[in-house]
Amino acid sequence: ALDAAYCFRNVQDNCCLRPLYIDFKRDLGWKWIHEPKGYNANFCAGACPYLWSSDTQHSRVLSLYNTINPEASASPCCVSQDLEPLTILYYIGKTPKIEQLSNMIVKSCKCS
Amino acid sequence: ALDAAYCFRNVQDNCCLRPLYIDFKRDLGWKWIHEPKGYNANFCAGACPYLWSSDTQHSRVLSLYNTINPEASASPCCVSQDLEPLTILYYIGKTPKIEQLSNMIVKSCKCS
């Protein structure tokens, strides 16, 4: 799996999970989230050569096609596969609210 | 939806469905498929600016982040959303076989 266990420990230019910290105020301008200050969101990046973690039959076809016709820019792309939620604390007036924001943290990637 | 009805009728540099015909022998080197000779596979391509058909909360976060730090290459990517199968005819010896290959045709796209 193209997850932290593999991607963070290897030199990998192909599609893989990359660490990325997001600061809510600084990076997104979101001032309404009280806690946490930011979080390890991660992201997916890298090339998708033939058979590199292809998600579907179409992505396998596309990556094979791309080896013959690279100028077509019709290659698969490295995107998130497994995502996890993030628990946040915010306030409505003086009332604290705890909420789970779904699909906020990328755990693994795929070529799609 | 970023499907043929919208994308094939509009000039759209952002993420959208693009037409692509794949010839099995010429483009993939697959000589085993007897019929069809090829098919309209389509593919997804284009930019994923903030809120353009974002698939998840993470892709919305990422596209917003990317406006501030484009050099990070941490932007969402335009990939297939809905896929359809393709029915093919091939032979094992002289025996014809009909099979449905799943996820061969892209019908719509998303930013993920």
């Epitope: 290897n10 990325l20 997001i22 600061d23 390890n40 | 290459s73």
Partner: antibody
């Protein structure tokens, strides 16, 4: 063990290009970002620029026209090139890593290498 | 660029003293501040990040706090190993900028 090590000529002539290499071990350049920071003798620290794990770069606008940072991931090396140097570029040059890309503070530093600009 | 004004530039203290160094940011940096210790001929060592988070392996006598645009590094009980120069750094906006440094010397 995470390590960074700067190397390059200790003396560069004015108007020439300063070239330094940062060789890293214990982590991958496709996972972490690497920054360059310099410190003139007896003075404070100046952030010069960085190279992302994905290969993109960001430079201090004060140096942007003269600075190029690149990397060779297979060799675990990051390079710095600073053109048209003057005596004001005499400094100890450090490469450093941020603990998570976009955290922007530096948890590991190289020992630094002194570069003197003089004819 | 965000200016980081650090004070004092030099501080004379004795072992066991409580020492405070301050850094004033020219604009809001939303707690995106780090503190480093540097000894002569050595590279800086990270002490504190996010204004108050202690880096792994750093003694608990070091602490960070903030009050508006002013950020403070406190050494609760100065040890012989703490005589060094200390720098603050904002990690909020490009280009990342440092304070001019505070040299803590033996009284």
């Amino acid at each position: 063990e995470v390590q960074l090590q700067e190397s390059g000529p200790g003396l560069v002539k004015p108007s020439e290009t300063l070239s330094l290499t940062c060789t890293v071990s214990g982590f991958s350049l496709t996972t972490y970002n690497v920054h360059w920071v310099r410190q003139p003798p007896g003075k404070g620290l100046e952030w010069m620029g960085l190279i992302w794990n994905t290969g993109g770069t960001r430079y201090n606008s004060a140096l942007k026209s003269r600075l190029t940072i690149s990397k060779d991931t297979s060799k675990s090396q990051v390079s710095l090139k600073l053109s048209s140097v003057t005596a004001a570029d005499t400094a100890v040059y450090y490469c450093a890593r941020d603990p998570v890309p976009n955290k922007w503070h530096f948890d590991f530093w190289g020992p630094g290498t002194l570069v003197t600009v003089s004819s | 660029d965000i200016q980081m004004t650090q004070s004092p530039s030099t501080l004379s203290a004795s072992v066991g003293d409580r020492v405070t160094i301050t850094c004033l940011a020219s604009e809001d940096i939303y707690s995106n501040l780090a503190w480093y210790q540097q000894k002569p001929g050595k590279s800086p060592k990270l002490l504190i990040y996010d204004a108050r988070s202690l880096q792994d392996g750093v003694p608990s006598r070091f602490s960070g706090s903030e009050s508006g645009p002013e950020y403070t590094l406190t050494i609760s009980s100065l040890q012989p190993d703490d005589f060094a120069t200390y720098f603050c750094q904002q990690h909020h906006a490009y280009p990342f900028t440092f304070g001019q440094g505070t040299k803590v010397e033996i009284k």
